[in-house]
């Protein structure tokens, strides 16, 4: 009874299509696979950024797989062929592992790369990234930003840089069609006549870095002798009402009475008739139904009632 063996996949490699971190892992079928022509051969692929403790594991019938990686670090991957038990009269047969690595040869010392990179997607409409130049770099150093997300044919360079002292320190992005809910890849590289500049790679999803506009049209309405309803409207823009959380801060006679987080555009406040001044502000943030994270908006303009009988008047700013 001869032992059934299968070869590992051939030509296993990590291919960088120039998408700033979105890589292809590709391989060819093992030699002598035709002996198992009636079988559905599978491949077990394991991969990770070097330094990560855990491998991602995929089992596939395909000859390729795609995923995003942090190009600031190297990537390692391994793959073997799996023959299911149906092909081998009983037990699954695995080939030896084929292994490969990939990394971008770093230029320049780490201190030359951009510092304090910060990206904000204002009101789910306008992406702006800013950074500080690397430590100890000369004024002739200039940084260039490139970006890619699935849907673009190739990586694009920023066309509207924010400058300080002649250096690029940020980028205002154009309208980014169909760019949310997918990985957004950025590379900031640099050039200098004096020394090589280290590139930096960043990956995020746009819906997680949204900073909305503050709410508008704040109003008071007396609901009863001891209740006041505070109301506001969602900010103008593309973000639907269902995507907002709000934080309100209410002050009564210069004392913070309430800080609360609510999901709707109303809040009912218990008060007494002795209240002489009532003010509130609201800010908004994209909620967990629409993103995994977000940035609070600025506070709205303050809306106040002062020295009048709230039972007689609805105040509209």
């Amino acid at each position: 009874d001869t032992e059934i063996k299968v070869n590992p996949p051939q030509d296993f490699e990590i291919v960088d299509p120039g998408y700033l971190g979105y890589l292809y892992l590709q391989w060819q079928p093992p030699l002598s696979l035709d002996h198992f022509k009636e079988c559905t051969v599978e491949y077990e692929l394991k991969y990770r950024n070097i330094g990560s403790e855990t491998w991602k594991t995929i089992i596939t019938k395909n000859l390729h797989y795609k995923d995003g990686f942090d190009l600031n670090k190297g990537i390692e991957a391994k793959i073997h062929t799996l023959l299911p038990w149906q092909c081998t009269n009983g037990s699954e047969v695995q080939s030896s592992w084929a292994e490969t690595t990939y990394w971008i040869s770093p230029q320049g010392i780490p201190e030359t790369k951009v510092q304090d990179m910060d990206c904000v997607y204002y009101n789910w409409q306008y992406l702006l990234c800013s950074w500080k130049p690397g430590i100890g770099v000369l004024l002739d150093t200039n940084y260039n930003l490139f970006y890619w997300y699935e849907g673009l044919d190739h990586a694009l360079q920023c066309v509207d840089y924010i400058k300080a002292d002649g250096q690029n320190i940020g980028c205002r992005f154009p309208y980014l069609e169909a760019s949310d809910y997918k990985d957004f890849y950025i590379c900031v590289n640099g050039s200098s006549e004096n020394k090589p500049i280290r590139s930096s790679y960043f990956t995020f999803q746009l819906q997680n870095i949204v900073k909305p506009l503050p709410p508008v049209y704040l109003t008071f309405t007396r609901e009863s002798s001891c209740e006041i309803k505070l109301k506001w409207s969602i900010p103008l823009g593309p973000i639907p009402a269902r995507c907002f959380d709000y934080e309100i801060e209410i002050r009564e006679d210069d004392t913070t009475l309430v800080t609360a987080t609510v999901e709707n555009e109303t809040y009912t406040l218990k008060t007494t008739n002795e209240t002489r001044q009532l003010c509130f502000v609201v800010r908004s943030k994209v909620n967990i139904y629409c993103s995994d994270d977000g940035i609070w908006s600025e506070w709205s303009d303050k809306q106040c009632w002062e020295g009048e009988d709230l039972s007689k008047k609805t105040l509209l700013r």
Partner: antibody, heavy 122, light 107 residues
């Protein structure tokens, strides 16, 4: 439409050099291995060289090893063949060919260019 | 290196004929054999890979069979556009070699 277009052929003296190019379009170039195959004046087909999809794996026919260099630029969707120390027996039509990709096999050629003629003669 | 020996080197046939071309490998290549069609002044065109799998758009009158060392390309009913030269190729392991070709001519 999937297309391969070769260029760079011509007349060259023995011992000379030539660089062939192949421009690919209509498919994801970085997904496929690519090869050069030549057809001699007596109509025989001869595999010359293959480069894997990412360029990490390269194979040459013994007859060209050490004289020819295959390379690719995935960003430009281009395949190249640098030929040096050319001999009369290298005279042929050189085809750029895409390596097929199926779950069973990949070393056949499923798309071919129109070919470019290389003539080595004094 | 694996040699591919094709026969016949040429044949004459009429429209509607059944045509068979054979290819013999010098060693076992499993089912790793492809067949190509080439017309004058044109590049080869893939017909069959892995011995019996028709390439996209290839008419069903073309079929391939065989394994190990003996392989066959069959054209079940020859059409006017099928007059051409046919090549076999093994795609088992480098170097990948071709047969010498079979020219199918009009009788």
């Amino acid at each position: 439409e999937v297309q391969l277009v070769e260029s760079g052929g011509g007349l060259v003296q023995p011992g000379g050099s030539l660089r062939l190019s192949c421009a690919a379009s209509g498919f994801t170039f970085s997904r496929n291995g690519m090869s050069w195959v030549r057809q001699t004046p007596d109509k025989r087909l001869e595999w010359v060289a293959t480069v894997s999809s990412g360029g990490s794996y390269i194979y040459y026919a013994d007859s060209v090893k050490g004289r020819f260099t295959i390379s690719r630029d995935n960003a430009k969707n281009s395949l190249y063949l640098q030929m040096s120390s050319l001999r009369a027996e290298d005279t042929a039509v050189y085809y750029c060919a895409r390596q097929g990709t199926t779950a069973l096999a990949t070393r056949f050629f499923d798309v071919w260019g129109q070919g470019t003629l290389v003539t080595v003669s004094s | 290196d694996i040699q591919m020996t094709q026969s016949p080197s040429s044949l004459s046939a009429s429209v509607g004929d059944r045509v068979t071309i054979t290819c013999k490998a010098s060693q076992d290549v499993g089912t790793a054999v492809a067949w190509y069609q080439q017309k004058p002044g044109k590049a080869p065109k893939l017909l069959i890979y892995s011995a019996s799998y028709r390439s996209t758009g290839v008419p069903s009158r073309f079929s391939g069979s065989g394994s190990g060392t003996d392989f066959t390309l069959t054209i079940s009913s020859l059409q006017p556009e099928d007059f051409a030269t046919y090549y076999c190729q093994h795609h088992y392991s480098a170097p990948w070699t071709f047969g010498g070709g079979t020219k199918v001519e009009i009788k």
